[in-house]
């Protein structure tokens, strides 16, 4: 299953399959997730080691048993790949690293005014993988405001150095934020020239294209079909690049198919997995396990659940079958692709779905009236769980926020439905940033059921929580995916990086905002919060957040929206915007419904009709 816990001051011994430099443990974990063999990783921050060569070292590891011995190493961080973790699987990495220079091949230098502008340039450059920016206070005046666009053979820095007044980060192309746009066309009977960066075997051009999309240096590809004249080259997928970023030439060639990486697509990237099953095809590879199962779909499920399994063949040969069950061969290879593809067999083959980010039809948990005042504009895909709850009576208007917690579930505040309990008047918009982008043609979800907490009373602050079941499940994308819920009664975690988002008022007597706003707000202890509210009881089912001096807060129209906190690289829904004394007033923190206190209720209400919890627990 999915394991999200990180181990501080621990290093996994042995099992190395690859090593690289990464700026932090989260990026290391992401590289492990996308590496075909990596199950575990260990990361050495700069502070943890004197050996300059090993600083920022990210060590990817495999283990037949799924685990390795841990040794104590001060400062080291270790953890698991996020394979099998559904919607948490993403190659998108937005963080900017201050005081760090990520080294690579510098292929472009320009002057820009901010690190965000530099990141945008990198995202809009086809060859840029990462960048470094020298701030206005950099010690050498001639380098100030320089934006260096970079690449490397593996897509990760060739070295990482601690350097004052330098900021580094990665391209946001994997976040589907590139302005370049992409070529979706597949060109039949056409071969591209240029440099081959890798060679893998694939059953069709679509798998070849997805592999190209997630390969750090692949810009385009050529696939040789299973009827290609040279037998040894059949099913070969050649991943390619060029100086210009486009093929310098193409040759008409029977039984070849060419196309482009989809990494530069805006708003939608293909999933990093291959779900199609190929009848009459055998995939060869190293044998992991053989099991008897009923049907090829169960074989694929079995492969998906066995974390080391990369692909499978389900044999229908009479000697491989017993009654209704046949042999399911679970296999792996060094690069995650079959070592041999045979056609005209009595088998069916396919790939593990361990990297599919749709996950199951579930809510995400972890084992471990009230625009945002004083906030700033959010960017695409920054808060993909944020939804807008709108009411359509004569006109249509945004009323509340909400959080997507599963394919078919939204969590919000009960008070959003005060006086409006009718489900047909509501429209739920997900995967949006600007309210002005909503037109009559914009797709929306309708409500199947509104579940208000049984102890909630209109115009009272207690138990201000409600679940919305959508009429139809939503697909997950980089812009529309759920937020993980905290553990039941989560009281031990100290959250220091918390954000509130919404389209609500920007001042007490304001109006709904167009662009989704975000504000970083510190949590306040319940004891402190209680002293600020002389007339209202702050219960253990509430959590407070705000600045002593005020100025930043949730406000009208933000109600029901998320208070999220990042802990160990993972966002969790800590609170639901509920109430407050005005907005952003000095010494008056916002009050939020504490989600951890309602986990039993959420789990109970999101149970599916067959009694199976629609919950995905990554830990």
């Amino acid at each position: 299953g999915c394991l999200t816990q990180l181990y501080e001051n621990a290093f996994f011994r042995g099992g190395d399959v690859a090593s690289m430099y990464t700026p932090n443990a989260q990026y290391c974990q992401m590289r492990c997730t996308f590496h075909p063999r990596c199950l575990l990783f260990s990361f050495l921050p700069a502070s943890s080691i004197n050996d300059m060569e090993k600083r920022f070292g990210c060590f990817l590891k495999d283990s037949v048993t799924g685990t390795l011995p841990k040794v104590h190493r001060t400062g080291a961080v270790s953890g698991h790949s996020l394979k099998q973790c559904g919607h948490q699987i993403s190659a998108c990495h937005r963080d900017i690293y201050k005081g760090v220079d990520m080294r690579g091949v510098n292929f472009n230098v320009s002057k820009v005014s901010s690190v965000e502008e530099c990141q945008k340039r990198c995202t809009s450059n086809i060859r840029c993988q990462f960048f470094s920016y020298a701030t206005q206070t950099f010690h050498k005046a001639e380098y100030r405001n320089n934006c260096l666009l970079k690449y490397s053979p593996g897509g990760t820095p060739t070295a990482i150095k601690v350097l004052s007044n330098v900021e580094s980060g990665f391209s946001l192309k994997p976040c589907a934020l590139s302005e370049i746009g992409c070529h979706m066309n597949i060109f039949q009977h056409l071969a591209f020239s240029d440099v081959d960066v890798a060679r893998v075997l694939t059953p069709d051009a679509f798998v070849c294209r997805t592999i190209c999309t997630y390969h750090p240096n692949c810009l385009f590809f050529t696939f040789y079909t299973n009827v290609w004249k040279i037998e040894s080259q059949r099913n070969v997928c050649l991943l390619k690049t060029s100086e210009s970023g486009t093929p310098s030439s193409s040759t008409p060639q029977e039984n070849t198919i060419s196309g482009y990486s989809l990494l530069t697509c805006k708003r939608t990237l293909p999933e990093p997995c291959h779900s199609k099953i190929y009848p009459g095809v055998d995939f060869g590879g190293e044998e992991l396990n053989v099991t008897f199962v009923k049907g090829v779909n169960v074989c694929q499920e079995t492969c998906t659940k066995m974390i080391r399994c990369q692909f499978f063949t389900y044999s229908l040969l009479p000697e491989d079958c017993k009654e209704e069950k046949c042999k399911c061969f679970l296999r792996l290879s060094m690069d995650g692709s079959p070592t041999r593809i045979a056609y005209g067999t009595q088998g069916s083959s396919g790939y593990s779905l361990r990297l599919c980010n749709t996950g199951d039809n579930s809510v995400c948990t972890t084992k471990t009236s009230t625009r945002i005042v004083g906030g700033t504009n959010s960017s695409w895909g920054e808060w993909p769980w944020q939804v807008s709850l709108q009411v359509k009576l004569t006109a249509q208007r945004h009323l509340c926020g909400g959080s997507l917690i599963g394919h078919q579930w939204v969590l919000t505040a009960a008070h959003c439905f005060d006086g409006l309990p009718l489900q047909d008047v509501w429209r739920i918009y997900s995967g949006i940033l600007n309210l002005s982008d909503i037109t009559k043609d914009t797709p929306f979800s309708q409500i199947k059921e509104i579940i208000i907490h049984q102890n909630y009373k209109v115009s009272e602050g207690n138990h201000d929580i409600a679940l919305i079941k959508l009429q139809a499940p939503l697909n997950y994308t980089e812009f529309q995916k759920p937020i993980c819920l905290p553990s039941k009664g989560d009281t031990s975690t100290i959250y220091t990086n918390c954000w509130v988002t919404g389209w609500g008022f920007s001042k007490e007597k304001g109006e709904i905002q167009n662009i989704l706003q975000k504000v970083n707000i510190p949590l306040v202890t319940n004891e402190e919060c209680q002293k600020r509210y002389q007339d209202y009881k702050i219960t253990q089912r509430m959590v407070c957040a705000g600045y002593k001096e005020g100025g930043k807060d949730a406000c009208k129209g933000d109600s029901g929206g998320p208070l999220v906190c990042k802990h160990n690289g993972m966002w969790r829904l800590v609170g639901i915007t509920s109430w407050g004394e005005g907005c952003a007033r000095r010494e008056q923190p916002g009050v939020y419904t504490k989600v951890a206190e309602y986990m039993d209720w959420i789990l109970e209400k999101t149970q599916s009709s067959d009694g199976k919890a629609q919950m995905q627990s990554p830990a």
Epitope: E460, G461, N462, Q530, K531, R532, Y533, Q534, D535, Y536, K537, I538, T539, E587
Partner: antibody, heavy 116, light 106 residues
Framework: EVQLQQSGAELVKPGASVRLSCTAS????????IFWVKQRPKQGLEWIGR????????KYDPKIQGKATLTADTSSNTAYLQLSSLTSEDSAIYYC?????????WGQGTLVSVSA | DIQMTQSPSSLSASVGDRVTITCEAS??????IAWYQQKPGQPPKLLIY???TLQSGVPSRFSGSGSGTEFTLTISNLQPEDFATYYC????????FGQGTKVEIK
């Protein structure tokens, strides 16, 4: 309208006990804290303690601990103050009050006279 | 525990006067001080909390100030209905009242 109705005056003998009541209307006592405050004749105010009727959690002034016991009955929306081993020092007006961080609304008070 | 020393214990003033009452805490109370007004035969009434925040419905002639351990209640334009006893209350650590200040007609 928020109201706290306190029980009538009590004349009690030294060494005895007394139970004072505070019945709320216009709100549910589970949604607030109930505080008790003592005021001796011609003297100042002294905080006795606080109860959270939702879970019966209590906090007392350390100087008064043992003298006073706070309880609540959510079904009748009533809070109680029990005073034991009474002496003349306990003769006072006892107020109940509701609030969050501090006492925002008060009852009219109950006079307790301890006399042989 | 925290002690609150209120002064003066009584004062005489006329309608229209500016009246100042002070309260000194034995420790820093992080501005968690409230002021109450009590008239004979009535329960106390909350005027100000968190040093300077006026409770709704309280006239603006009442104001509070201070920080650390020294706090002040000011009545800027004394009205006939303001003759009463005033108490400070610290609520940073449990609750402690000051001894009270009686404001009488001169």
């Amino acid at each position: 309208e928020v109201q706290l109705q306190q029980s009538g005056a009590e004349l009690v003998k030294p060494g005895a006990s007394v139970r004072l009541s505070c019945t709320a209307s216009g709100f549910n006592i589970k949604d607030t804290y109930i505080f008790w405050v003592k005021q001796r004749p011609k003297q100042g105010l002294e905080w006795i303690g606080r109860i959270d009727p939702e879970n019966d959690n209590t906090k007392y002034d350390p100087k008064i601990q043992g003298k006073a016991t706070l309880t609540a009955d959510t079904s009748s929306n009533t809070a109680y103050l029990q005073l034991s081993s009474l002496t003349s020092e306990d003769s006072a007006i006892y107020y109940c009050a509701k609030g969050g961080g501090l006492f925002a609304y008060w009852g009219q008070g109950t006079l307790v006279s301890v006399s042989a | 525990d925290i002690q609150m020393t209120q002064s003066p214990s009584s004062l005489s003033a006329s309608v229209g006067d500016r009246v100042t009452i002070t309260c000194e805490a034995s420790h820093d109370i992080n501005n968690y001080i409230a002021w109450y007004q009590q008239k004979p035969g009535q329960p106390p009434k909350l005027l100000i909390y968190y040093t300077s925040t006026l409770q709704s419905g309280v006239p603006s002639r009442f104001s509070g100030s201070g920080s650390g351990t020294e706090f002040t209640l000011t009545i800027s334009n004394l009205q006939p209905e303001d003759f009463a006893t005033y108490y400070c209350l610290q609520y940073d650590n449990l609750f402690t009242f000051g001894q009270g200040t009686k404001v009488e007609i001169k």
